[in-house]
């Protein structure tokens, strides 16, 4: 049995920050999970972690040098991702694992959510809008 | 006028390397996420790779490690590099840019709104 | 990878004709569905977006219509300039697939 999960299509970074909501078919209260966030259409970079113990405290970090926090809701996690540049464009998925109690469970992937950060480019580059809706 | 123009098909044995191009007119690259498709003779269309509008890039499993998509943002181009080819890579290779809508809590890419009229590799010995 | 799977593969009808195409989805695609037409030997030209949304410049004789995994393009009376390869193209998840294609040939 795998956990569904549902992310937006598409998120915009006008101020370099985004919230992304991780949407699961299942409760995350009093379980203990992990839920990550990973870059690319393979999923090579994890981005940010939260990690939730029923006895302990949220536990959110990252391991590759995200700005990042996490807020948890019974089936859901918000990932709070800050200090985006224009160079991390992308599609981010969401992961979740549940430890205890058994059995194990981890998801189906999900579509991704397209991370769009507009502004705060590493290096200069002329802005255009973008097509307008037709 | 919004444009898109491949240049760089041609003929190459197995194991050879193409650079094709993807020229725009009418709009930037560098803040448009664009794709590569292909078409092989007689065949439905394939995506190939996309370059994001910061310079992040996906390629589907077919290619991967195999082809790289790059940009130069003040010749306003994309490029496909080819290398190892195979003759199932022999089709009509497109650029497309993704279409780009709506305001921040609805926001998406609606569809490839502009097309280059392609160019053909032809892998083969 | 979503698989779309479009019916019929030929459709054989006059000018003046009303066309129905259909695409089916391998699992729910919401209405994140586009549709292109490609003529011999031209690049794909989009037509409909989101399901039932005309691009730019497409006339009004073209409509889409669906959601979930069943999807229709009506072309409500058929010009000449229409026939042509029609296909389907999904944005739900990664990466964009199409389905097969059906051909649209006068009759």
């Known amino acids: 049995n795998k956990i569904l999960v549902k992310q937006s299509p598409m998120l915009v970074a006008y101020d370099n920050a985004v919230n992304l909501s991780c949407k699961y078919s299942y409760n995350l209260f009093s379980r203990e999970f992990r839920a990550s966030l990973h870059k690319g259409l393979d999923s090579a970079v994890e981005v940010c972690v939260v990690y939730g113990n029923y006895s302990q405290q949220l536990q959110v970090y990252s391991k590759t040098g995200f700005n990042c926090d996490g807020k948890l809701g019974n089936e859901s996690v918000t990932f709070y991702l800050q200090n985006l540049y224009v160079n991390q464009t992308d599609i981010y998925f969401c992961k979740i694992e549940v430890m205890y109690p058994p059995p194990y469970l981890d998801n189906e992937k999900s579509n991704g959510t397209i991370i769009h950060v507009k502004g705060k480019h590493l290096c200069p580059s002329p802005l255009f809008p973008g097509p307008s809706k037709p | 006028e919004v444009q898109l123009e491949e240049s760089g098909g041609g003929l190459v044995q197995p194991g050879g390397s193409l650079r094709l191009s993807c020229a725009a007119s009418?709009?930037?690259?560098?803040?448009?996420?664009m794709s590569w498709f292909r078409q092989a003779p007689g065949k439905g269309l394939e995506w190939v790779s996309v370059i994001y509008s910061g310079g992040s890039i996906n390629h589907a499993d077919s290619v991967k490690g195999r082809f790289t998509t790059s940009k130069h943002n003040s010749k306003n181009t994309v490029y496909l590099q080819m290398n190892s080819l195979r003759s199932e890579d022999t089709a009509v290779y497109y650029c497309?840019?993704?279409?780009?809508?709506?305001?921040?809590?609805?926001?998406?890419?609606?569809?490839?709104?502009?097309w280059g009229q392609g160019t053909t590799v032809t892998v083969s010995s | 990878e979503i698989v779309l799977t479009q019916s019929p593969a030929t459709l054989s009808l006059s000018p003046g004709e009303r066309a129905t195409l259909s695409c089916r989805a391998s699992?729910?695609?919401?209405?994140?569905l586009a549709w292109y037409q490609q003529k011999p030997g031209q690049a794909p030209r989009l037509l409909i977006y989101?399901?039932?949304n005309r691009a730019t410049g497409i006339p009004a004789r073209f409509s889409g219509s669906g959601s979930g995994t069943d999807f229709t393009l009506t072309i409500s009376s058929l010009e000449p300039e229409d026939f042509a390869i029609y296909y389907c193209q999904q944005r739900s998840n990664w990466p964009p697939t199409f389905g097969q294609g059906t051909k649209v040939e006068i009759k």
């Open positions: 009418g709009f930037t690259v560098s803040s448009n996420f």
């Open positions: 699992q729910s695609v919401s209405s994140y």
């Open positions: 497309a840019r993704h279409g780009i809508t709506g305001t921040t809590g609805d926001y998406h890419y609606y569809g490839m709104d502009v």
């Open positions: 989101d399901a039932s």
